[in-house]
């Protein structure tokens, strides 16, 4: 912890200015008033402080605002944001997208995924929902950050906002997040024609149930392998060989390359080998001819 000393008269700080880079840690601690610092936070980022000096300034703000910084301070944190932990950020209440933009810019090029995720979470909580302006800000300043939100937070996205989401914004989304986003996307794009609908819904298909995937197989969509590989395992397993063939169209040949990877591997294990042979791809591992398949889970459910 920073040792407490009294401030020498000639070092007294009446304004946050560029002279402070020449102060030692203990001088900063003794001579900078926390309230003055908070009031003049907008000056801090223009001054090339050392990381050690920034630690002292953070310590002062922490003492002044033990319950969390006000947004007037947060907005002007600048490089001091790099010193914040997710625990610090959890105490904040942020509603301004200007604040979000400013801090996202600062975090660029630094390993701050946990802090950024927490910040975005606080913005969504502060604004009450994940509205279009917030989504637009995230997609513009932090591609991929949408996926840092929990499924619970994502559930506050109105379907009308889904159109603002680009495919690359969903690249890092996990199954649980896509489970939340897919029904919203389905609703948002429901009035589109077949091919246009598929283009729009494709990035969200990792959250699609079996029946929707089956429906797509009837629409000549020619799903690419990358999209197929992102489908939920549970959505793929019930598909027949014929349905997968129709779903993938000319891309069906790619199954051979992905033969050892989930969900293709798991799907192969559920298919009859002679059905797989009809694809002419040399896929191996299906159920041999003449074998009977007992679904024990059904029996257990009945007993």
């Amino acid at each position: 912890d920073v040792e407490r000393t009294t401030c020498p008269p000639e070092k007294e700080v009446h304004e946050i200015d560029e002279s402070l880079i020449f102060y030692k840690k203990r001088e900063l601690e003794a001579c900078v008033d926390a309230a003055l610092l908070a009031a003049q936070m907008d000056r801090v980022d223009a001054i090339p402080f050392t990381y050690e000096q920034l630690d002292v300034l953070k310590h002062k703000l922490d003492e002044l605002y033990p319950q969390g910084y006000p947004e007037s301070v947060i907005r002007h944190l600048g490089h001091l944001f790099l010193k914040m932990s997710p625990e610090d950020i959890r105490k904040w209440n942020v509603t301004s997208l200007e604040t979000l933009k400013a801090l996202l810019k600062v975090s660029k090029g630094h390993e701050m995924s946990a802090q950024v995720a927490t910040l975005i979470d606080r913005v969504v909580v502060g604004r009450g929902q994940l509205d279009k302006d917030t989504v637009d800000t995230l997609t513009a300043f932090c591609p991929g950050c949408l996926c840092s939100l929990s499924p619970e937070r994502l559930s506050s996205v109105p379907p009308s906002v889904i159109g603002a989401v680009r495919p690359q914004d969903l690249d890092t989304c996990g199954p649980r997040q896509l489970d939340v986003l897919y029904p919203k996307a389905r609703l948002a794009f429901q009035n589109m024609s077949g091919s246009e609908y598929f283009v729009k819904i494709r990035p969200f298909l990792g959250g699609a149930p079996t029946e929707d995937v089956k429906a797509l197989s009837q629409q000549n969509v020619s799903m690419d392998l990358a999209t197929f590989m992102k489908l939920r395992r549970e959505a793929v397993l019930p598909l027949t060989v014929a349905e997968v063939q129709k779903l993938l169209g000319p891309h069906v040949e790619g199954l051979k390359v992905e033969e050892q990877h989930s969900p293709v591997r798991d799907w192969i294990l559920k298919q009859r080998q002679d059905d797989l042979d009809t694809l002419g791809l040399g896929l191996q591992g299906g159920i041999p001819n003449g074998y009977l398949i007992l679904d024990l889970s059904v029996r257990e459910a009945l007993s």
Epitope: K11, E15, P48, T50
Partner: antibody, heavy 120, light 112 residues
């Protein structure tokens, strides 16, 4: 454009004090620090001190007890006061702007200087 | 205080030649923030000093590219690739990493 102009008494008697004013234009003293530098005839530059945007000061260690720098932002003026002058304080005195933003504390613009002779 | 030692004190050159001035500091000029606040100034006869190079190697606006600065830590160099008449004068290095700021004693560039 950026300009700095020093004005001083020219001649000071030994043991008396010196007051010089630096009047600036083209920028604000609330955004830039000002350094004072002197140069004895035929010699090198000696940094005297600086007044920062917030009004704080730093001084040359050897001259600290004799120097005082202040400013009036509204009048765009910086003042140098130096006490107990001796003949070896005879020099040309310059004020210069410290650009801490883009140029990182370098003195990017200088006044033309004012000549001070200490003599009885 | 940081002592800045410049060599040589006087540097006679022929026009068109390369000139090199050395500046050494008594302690490292790397600030805790990672910047090195070492600057070069030129004072032509009868004029005020003018900024040439800031932060070791950055040319100030309007300074010709025949001027270049290099170095790190405590050792720095100013090079003029082809000396012209207008380059004659006294060159000073200066540090603003530590307060008080200090200047080197100067190097006079003159015609051989």
């Amino acid at each position: 454009q950026v300009q700095l102009k020093e004005s001083g008494p020219g001649l000071v008697a030994p043991s008396q004090s010196l007051s010089i004013t630096c009047t600036v234009s083209g920028f604000s003293l609330s955004s830039y620090a000002i350094s004072w530098v002197r140069q004895p005839p035929g010699k090198g530059l000696e940094w005297l001190g600086v007044i920062w945007t917030g009004g704080g000061t730093n001084y040359n260690s050897a001259l600290k007890s004799r120097l005082s720098i202040s400013k009036d932002n509204s009048k765009s003026q910086v003042f140098l006061k130096m006490n107990s002058l001796q003949t070896d304080d005879t020099a040309r005195f310059y004020c210069a702007r410290n650009n801490y933003g883009r140029l990182d504390y370098a003195m990017d613009y200088w006044g033309q200087g004012t000549s001070v002779t200490v003599s009885s | 205080d940081v002592v800045m030692t410049q060599t040589p004190l006087s540097l006679p050159v022929s026009l068109g030649d390369q000139a090199s001035i050395s500046c050494r500091s008594s302690q490292s000029l790397v600030h805790g923030n990672g910047n090195t606040y070492l600057h070069w100034y030129l004072q032509k006869p009868g004029q005020s000093p003018k900024l040439l190079i800031y932060k070791v190697s950055n040319r100030f606006s309007g300074v010709p590219d025949r001027f270049s600065g290099s170095g790190s830590g405590t050792d720095f160099t100013l090079k003029i690739s082809r000396v012209e008449t207008e380059d004659l004068g006294v060159y000073f290095c200066s540090q603003s990493t530590h307060v008080p700021f200090t200047f080197g004693s100067g190097t006079k560039l003159e015609i051989k």
